[in-house]
Structures are given as structure tokens and as C-alpha cells.
């Protein structure tokens, strides 16, 4: 899609990366909010979950998400046959048996009920960004990140390294 993209070029092999072990290295229960401090909330509607990005009223309780961390080997992009290093991947679960999924065809982020082992669409490369923020890159679609669009979560293509710090793909994790 983005032939000139450094991010795309480098991470085109993300889907070939191997999760080292099927057990998470650690888990973390946190609230998820945007760079602008809007909360990510989850609501059960018609037997399915909807994801919202909204301002909470004062003292309103934030929804929590269970982040499960996985260590993953990254294949070398130049030759395709070597290991270029390690990265951290996460899955995000706001409630039992439901996980955030990347729907690359619809460019959407959805909550799906599924059993383990989880599909690749539920895995995201966790990026440690400036200003105590993180970003989530799709394992199945390198160069595509979870972002905020029209008060919903969506998949956003990042076409250059400069855009990695675009505010709409930056999120904050908090224990409170």
C-alpha cells in the first residue's frame, strides 16, 4: 500500500513474527485513554460490545482492559531469513473471553469473542512513545495502528516514521 513508507517497508514481515511461547510474559490491568485524555469505554449492546471514545463525567469509573504481554521475535527485513531482534506484542481484553481485533478490511477495531489460541488479528506490537504514551501496531497489517476517528477506534495507516507521533494513534495506560 505504501511503497515508500519506512514503517511499512520495515514491518512488512510482522505477520511472520513468532510469538515466543503461548503464555504471556506478564499481564496488566489498566484503563486506556487517548492522548487528549478521553476514555476508551466498552458497552454491551444487542449482545455485542461497542467501543467508544468519550469524555467521562467527574468521578465516573473508567473501564479497564487486561493487557497480556508477549515476547516476539522479529524477522530481519533485509534478507527475510534472519532474526532482527525482539519486540513486545500485546492482546487487549476488556472483559472475559472478548478481545480487541483488527478488522483490516473495514479499517475498524472490534471486540470479538474467541478461544485461545487467539488469532493474529488480536495481536498488536506495542510501541513505547514519548510523553508517556504508547501505540498499537497491527500484527496482521504492518504500518497500521489503532487510532481515534470520529469518537471511535479505527485502524489508521501510518505512511512515514514522522507520523508515528501523530496524536490520534497515541494512547495512555493508567492503573487508575
Amino acid at each position: 500500500a505504501f511503497g515508500i513508507s519506512g514503517v511499512q517497508k520495515y514491518t512488512r514481515a510482522l505477520h511472520d513474527s513468532s510469538i515466543t511461547g503461548i503464555s504471556p510474559i506478564t499481564e496488566y490491568l489498566a484503563s486506556l485513554s487517548t492522548y487528549n485524555d478521553q476514555s476508551i469505554t466498552f458497552a454491551l449492546e444487542d449482545e455485542s460490545y461497542e467501543i467508544y471514545v468519550e469524555d467521562l463525567k467527574k468521578d465516573e469509573k473508567k473501564d479497564k482492559v487486561l493487557l497480556s504481554y508477549y515476547e516476539s521475535q522479529h524477522p530481519s527485513n533485509e534478507s527475510g531469513d534472519g532474526v532482527d531482534g525482539k519486540m513486545l506484542m500485546v492482546t487487549l481484553s476488556p472483559t472475559k473471553d472478548f478481545w480487541l481485533h483488527a478488522n483490516n478490511k473495514e479499517h475498524s477495531v472490534e471486540l470479538h469473542k474467541c478461544e485461545k489460541p487467539l488469532p493474529d488479528q488480536a495481536f498488536f506490537v506495542l510501541h513505547n512513545m514519548h510523553s508517556n504514551c504508547v501505540s498499537f501496531e497491527c500484527k496482521t497489517d504492518p504500518g497500521v495502528f489503532i487510532g481515534v476517528k470520529d469518537n471511535h477506534l479505527a485502524l489508521i495507516k501510518v505512511d512515514s516514521s514522522e507520523n508515528l507521533c501523530t496524536e490520534n494513534i497515541l494512547f495512555k495506560l493508567s492503573e487508575t
Epitope: 519506512g6 514503517v7 517497508k9 520495515y10 514491518t11 510474559i25 506478564t26 499481564e27 496488566y28 490491568l29 489498566a30 493487557l67 504481554y69 522479529h74 530481519s76 527485513n77 533485509e78 532482527d84 531482534g85 525482539k86 519486540m87 513486545l88 506490537v125 506495542l126 510501541h127 513505547n128 512513545m129 514519548h130 504508547v134 512515514s160 516514521s161 514522522e162 507520523n163 508515528l164 507521533c165 495506560l173
Partner: antibody, heavy 119, light 111 residues
């Protein structure tokens, strides 16, 4: 193969300037955060400066703020460290380092280049 | 800044013995539920090499005899059975916040 090769070190007088370079190969340079870490002779390691992928953010250790500038040229796959107002205590081997993909730790290191500040 | 204190300064052991190195942080290095404490090995005339990241995860190509443990402020690097090539200086380092800091190092020498 992922490689980092530093150059530009040498002998310089106190108050002088030097520019270090780090040529990167074997990976898509622009996607990674890069740093300089130094080691004085017979001493431990000290982080000096970091620049994010995309050149958006830079950070420095207090002792070099206002004197050193980290920069990168993604078109040349090269990291730089411009060092001005050099002091004797800046004498060290300077290592270029690449973060892992996702920017959580220093994963790849160059062989280093020696900077000696002396009159 | 976060100060990392390593002990002992020097460890004198024989090949085949178990080495236990300690690193203590002046405050927690936890962030996002991860312990952002890394271990490096350095041999004379060589650059450091990543051994362990996020307290307990081995870097690429690192032998299984190296293991890391700990959380919060107290961390340990263990070499289960020392090989001749393991005699070197070991540094812990925190990547929780700027300035990124290193411990002063532990030298593992042949007894």
C-alpha cells in the same frame, strides 16, 4: 546483517568541537529510535542522547544539554552527534545504539569511536 | 534520576559455578506493568551486548544459562553454570524514564 559503524572520533582540545557519525545498515533506519551511549576509560556506561524515529523527539543527559546535539539523516541512514564546548570529562568511547522495534531497550550496539579531549 | 546499584562489585568464581548478580533501583522501574530493567554483558575492547530485557526475557541468541528475575526495585541476573566466555563485566540499565541510567557494573572474574 544489522550493523552500526561509528566514525569521527579523535583528539580535540578543551572547548573544541567534533561531529560523530554512525552509519546504519541491514534495517530500515527511519523506523527506529537511536541513541548515543559513552564509556570513559576504565569506567561504566553513561547514556548521552536519544532521537526518536521520525526525528520528532530528542532527549539528553543533563551534563551535555546545550553543548551536544543529536540528529539523523534518514536518507543517508546516518546518526550524528555534534559535540561543542568539549571538556576533559567528555573523553570516552562513544557507542551508537539502536532500540528494538517498539523502542523498549537498547538492542544493537556499534563498536564505538574514541573521543579524547586534552590540551 | 533513577540510581541503580549493583552488587557485588567483583565476583570471583570458577567455570561451572553459578553466578548471582544483583541490581537495586532507587525507585520502581515498573511502567505499564512491565519491569523496564535490562542486563548487558561487556568484554574488554568490545561493545555491550544485550542479555536480558524487561527483567526476565532473553535477547536474541542469548544462551539459556542466562536468566533474569525480579520486579519493582530488586533484580537478579543468574548464570546457571559459568562458561569460560562468560567472564566479563555485567551492567543493569533502566529504560523506564530519561535519563536512562546504568549500574556501575559487576565484574565476573576467574577464581
Amino acid at each position: 546483517e544489522v550493523q552500526l559503524v561509528e566514525s569521527g572520533g579523535g583528539l580535540v582540545q578543551p572547548g573544541g568541537s567534533l561531529r560523530l557519525s554512525c552509519a546504519a545498515s541491514g534495517f530500515t533506519f527511519s523506523s527506529f529510535s537511536m541513541s548515543w551511549v559513552r564509556q570513559a576509560p576504565g569506567k561504566g556506561l553513561e547514556w548521552v542522547a536519544t532521537i526518536s524515529g521520525g526525528k520528532t523527539f530528542t532527549d539528553y543527559v543533563d551534563s551535555v544539554k546545550g553543548r551536544f546535539t543529536i540528529s539523523r539523516d534518514d536518507s543517508k541512514n546516518t546518526l550524528y552527534l555534534q559535540m561543542n564546548s568539549l571538556r576533559a570529562e567528555d573523553t570516552a568511547v562513544y557507542y551508537c545504539t539502536r532500540a528494538n522495534y517498539g523502542n523498549w531497550f537498547f538492542e544493537v550496539w556499534g563498536q564505538g569511536t574514541l573521543v579524547t579531549v586534552s590540551s | 534520576e533513577i540510581v541503580l546499584t549493583q552488587s557485588p562489585a567483583t565476583l570471583s568464581l570458577s567455570p561451572g559455578e553459578r553466578a548471582t548478580l544483583s541490581c537495586r533501583a532507587s525507585e520502581s522501574v515498573a511502567k505499564y506493568g512491565l519491569s523496564l530493567l535490562n542486563w548487558f554483558q561487556q568484554k574488554p575492547g568490545q561493545p555491550p551486548r544485550l542479555l536480558i530485557f524487561a527483567a526476565s526475557n532473553r535477547g536474541s541468541g542469548v544462551p539459556a544459562r542466562f536468566s533474569g528475575s525480579g520486579s519493582g526495585t530488586d533484580f537478579t541476573l543468574t548464570i546457571s553454570s559459568l562458561e569460560p566466555e562468560d567472564f566479563a563485566v555485567y551492567y543493569c540499565q533502566q529504560s523506564k524514564e530519561v535519563p536512562f541510567t546504568f549500574g556501575q557494573g559487576t565484574k565476573v572474574e576467574i577464581k
